[in-house]
Structures are given as C-alpha cells and as structure tokens.
C-alpha cells in the first residue's frame, strides 16, 4: 500500500471527511477527471488539482497534529505527479506563487503574452506538426 | 496574423509593458516553458500559466478601455489551449474557482484525496502501461 493512504485516512479523521454528508452536491475533482481520457487533457486538469492541494496544505501548515500526514502526501504527490523531478516541481511552484496583483508581475505577464500564446497549441511546438496540420487543412478545404 | 497579437500589443501599451525595464530580473513564463519539451509536462505548466492570465483578466474586468482586447485574447486562448472545447474550458474554470478556505470544499477535497492520488501517475490509467512498467522495473532490478 502506498504511504499516502494511511496519512490520507488520518486527514479524513481530522477534517471529519469520512462523514456521509461530504458526498452531498457531487464531487470536486473525481467527476472532472472522469471526463478526460487523453493524457494531455488530464495533465491540464491535474495541474489545477495538485495546485489546489498544495494551497490547502499550505493553509494548514500551523496544525502540528497533521504535519506528518501532509508532508508524506506531498512527497508522494511529488513522486507520482512530478516523477520525483525537483526542477519540474520547482518550476510548478514558481508558477503557482506569482501574485496577480503585483504590478511588476502584471507587466511581465503582458510583456510575455504574445510568445506564451504562440506556444499554447501543441502544433506550435514543431514545424513538422504544423506542416502536416496545414496539409490536413488544405485537404479539407479542397474536399 | 492571429487576432490576439494586435490586442496583446494594445494591452502592452495599457500596462506600459513594452518598456525595456520589464525584462529585468528574468521572465515569468518563457524560461519555464523552455525547460519542458514533453507535451504532458508542457500542459502541466501551461495549465498554471493560463489560469494566471484568466485571474489577471478577471482582476481588470472593470477597465472598459481594455475589455475588447481581453475578450479577444481569452477567446483565442480558448481556441488554442482548449481546442474550442467548451466542456474542457468549463471544467478547467470550475477547478480554478474552488475556494481553499471553504470548509465544505476542504472536506470534499480530503474525502477525494486517495482516489485523486491513485490517478496521478500516467501508469495508473491503464493496466497495460502498469504491466510494462512492472516489467521494466523487474528488468532493472535483475541487472
């Protein structure tokens, strides 16, 4: 059994989250995850879910009684979601920590917007994909 | 030229973000995007970047002078990042809007944690992948 299971059960007790009323009004994450089978779509959703848990754990970092559980779960998330890649985890954390109300951050974000947008679609990454996409479009147009 | 380019230039003027000092102290997003070539890694990072821009745009929603630009850019993000898939965009927005201090949300998140964790690594999705991973591990162990 993965180490997180026991610790997650401990958090369930603390948050009284095993209670039947918790399931009222649907799920937060599980229903959404069910909707997406494609790996890249799942990563888009899981990225938001993982950042939510990191924020939640950060919010409760002064509760000593659950710190061991939180640390174990975070470490297991690190293994599962970031493949224990510290650089990946650090870059992710950087992105989650930018303040949307900091003027310098706002200006930088707008400064980088055109380049960020240009990279958003998978096709933007490789000339090869772009070309095949153009051919596909051409074929469709000529049908 | 994509419609967002002209509108992003308009935002640059508004935020005075074309100024040379904006590039001081490195980039927010571009440096991080350069680090990741693998599509699923890029999606993890882009998910955070896109949610940052959505938050930024929301923050400026009462500035009428930039609303047209913001709407055009958001629409183009929708096309590029969500492949114009409304369901994908809606699920994403749902995830970004959960409040980390709402007790009901906290309890639900903890209630779902074990299942979320079980789905985090790509291997968790298919028995086939899991088996090949086990074989790979076995091979490594016997070397």
């Amino acid at each position: 059994q993965d180490p997180y299971v026991k610790e997650a059960e401990n958090l369930k007790k603390y948050f009284n989250a095993g209670h039947s009323d918790v399931a009222d009004n649907g799920t937060l994450f599980l229903g959404i995850l069910k909707n997406w089978k494609e790996e890249s779509d799942r990563k888009i959703m899981q990225s938001q879910i993982v950042s939510f848990y990191f924020k939640l754990f950060k919010n409760f970092k002064d509760d000593q009684s659950i710190q061991k559980s939180v640390e174990t779960i975070k470490e297991d998330m690190n293994v599962k979601f970031f493949n224990s890649n510290k650089k990946k985890r650090d870059d992710f954390e950087k992105l989650t920590n930018y303040s949307v109300t900091d003027l310098n951050v706002q200006r930088k974000a707008i400064h980088e917007l055109i380049q960020v947008m240009a990279e958003l679609s998978p096709a933007a990454k490789t000339g090869k994909r772009k070309r095949s996409q153009m051919l596909f479009r051409g074929r469709r147009a000529s049908q | 030229q994509d419609p967002y380019v002209k509108e992003a230039e308009n935002l640059k003027k508004y935020f005075n973000a074309g100024h040379s000092d904006v590039a001081d102290n490195g980039t927010l997003f571009l440096g991080i995007l350069k680090n990741w070539k693998e599509e699923s890694d890029r999606k993890i990072m882009q998910s955070q970047i896109v949610s940052f821009y959505f938050k930024l745009f929301k923050n400026f929603k009462d500035d009428q002078s930039i609303q047209k630009s913001v709407e055009t850019i958001k629409e183009d993000m929708n096309v590029k990042f969500f492949n114009s898939n409304k369901k994908k965009r809606d699920d994403f927005e749902k995830l970004t809007n959960y409040s980390v201090t709402d007790l009901n949300v906290q309890r639900k998140a903890i209630h779902e944690l074990i299942q979320v964790m079980a789905e985090l690594s790509p291997a968790a999705k298919t028995g086939k992948r899991k088996r090949s991973q086990m074989l790979f591990r076995g091979r490594r162990a016997s070397q």
């Epitope: 603390y14 009284n16 950060k58 919010n59 409760f60 970092k61 002064d62 509760d63 009684s65 | 201090t101």
Partner: nanobody, 120 residues
Framework: QVQLVESGGGLVQTGDSLRLSCVAS????????MGWFRQPPGKERDFVAR????????SYATSVEGRFAISRDNAKNTVYLQMNSLKPEDTAVYYC?????????????WGQGTQVTVSS
C-alpha cells in the same frame, strides 16, 4: 481555565458591516486555534469560521465564505470576525470558542455570546 469575552454585536441593515472581537484570558492564547460559531433564533449552534494559532489554518462555513474574514492578534490575545455584506439570515448570537488541539473545530471553552441582528 480560559475565559472568552465577545463584543461588537449590534443591530445593522442588510448590506452593512460589523466587526466582532473576542478577548481571551487565563491561557496561552498563541498556542490554540480559535473559532466563531453562531446560533440563529430557534436553531442549533453552528460553525462559522476557525483560525489556527499562528493566523493560518483558516476555514469558513460555505454560507459566509467570501463575506466574513477571521483574523487574530496574538499580542492582544484577541480574535476578530469581520462581517461584510450582512444578510437577514446572519442574525444570530455569535460565540467565540477556543478549539481542542488536534481537531479542526471542536470547541472546549465558550464565550457568553454577542447578539447580531440584521434587519431588511
């Protein structure tokens, strides 16, 4: 034995704001989590908000999330509840409580309460 004294209640109009205070004595205030609860007329006492000993570990009832803000000043042994955009359904006696260590919002000591009435 911890003593808790609430203040700041009163009669206000819909949409107004109020700030409740709760002063603690007789214990090491900075070592325990604090919470606010409320009891509307004819109903049970219910959780409103909680805050950990250092000002983190915050939770709100869904009904007040985004309108109420809990904070604390350990130097003054005081916990606050800032209540904005008040509604008639916020009418209740508001109680401050210290919370049992290692629990999310299980109270061990209560104040005597302060009445908040929101008229439409």
């Amino acid at each position: 034995q911890v003593q808790l004294v609430e203040s700041g209640g009163g009669l206000v109009q819909t949409g107004d704001s109020l700030r409740l205070s709760c002063v603690a004595s007789g214990g090491t205030f900075s070592r325990y989590a604090m919470g606010w609860f409320r009891q509307p007329p004819g109903k049970e006492r219910d959780f409103v908000a909680r805050i950990g000993y250092s000002g983190q570990s915050i939770s709100y009832a869904t009904s007040v999330e985004g309108r109420f803000a809990i904070s604390r000043d350990n130097a003054k042994n005081t916990v606050y509840l800032q209540m904005n955009s008040l509604k008639p359904e916020d009418t209740a006696v508001y109680y401050c409580a210290s919370l049992v260590s290692g629990t999310l919002y299980k109270p061990n000591y209560w104040g005597q309460g302060t009445q908040v009435t929101v008229s439409s």
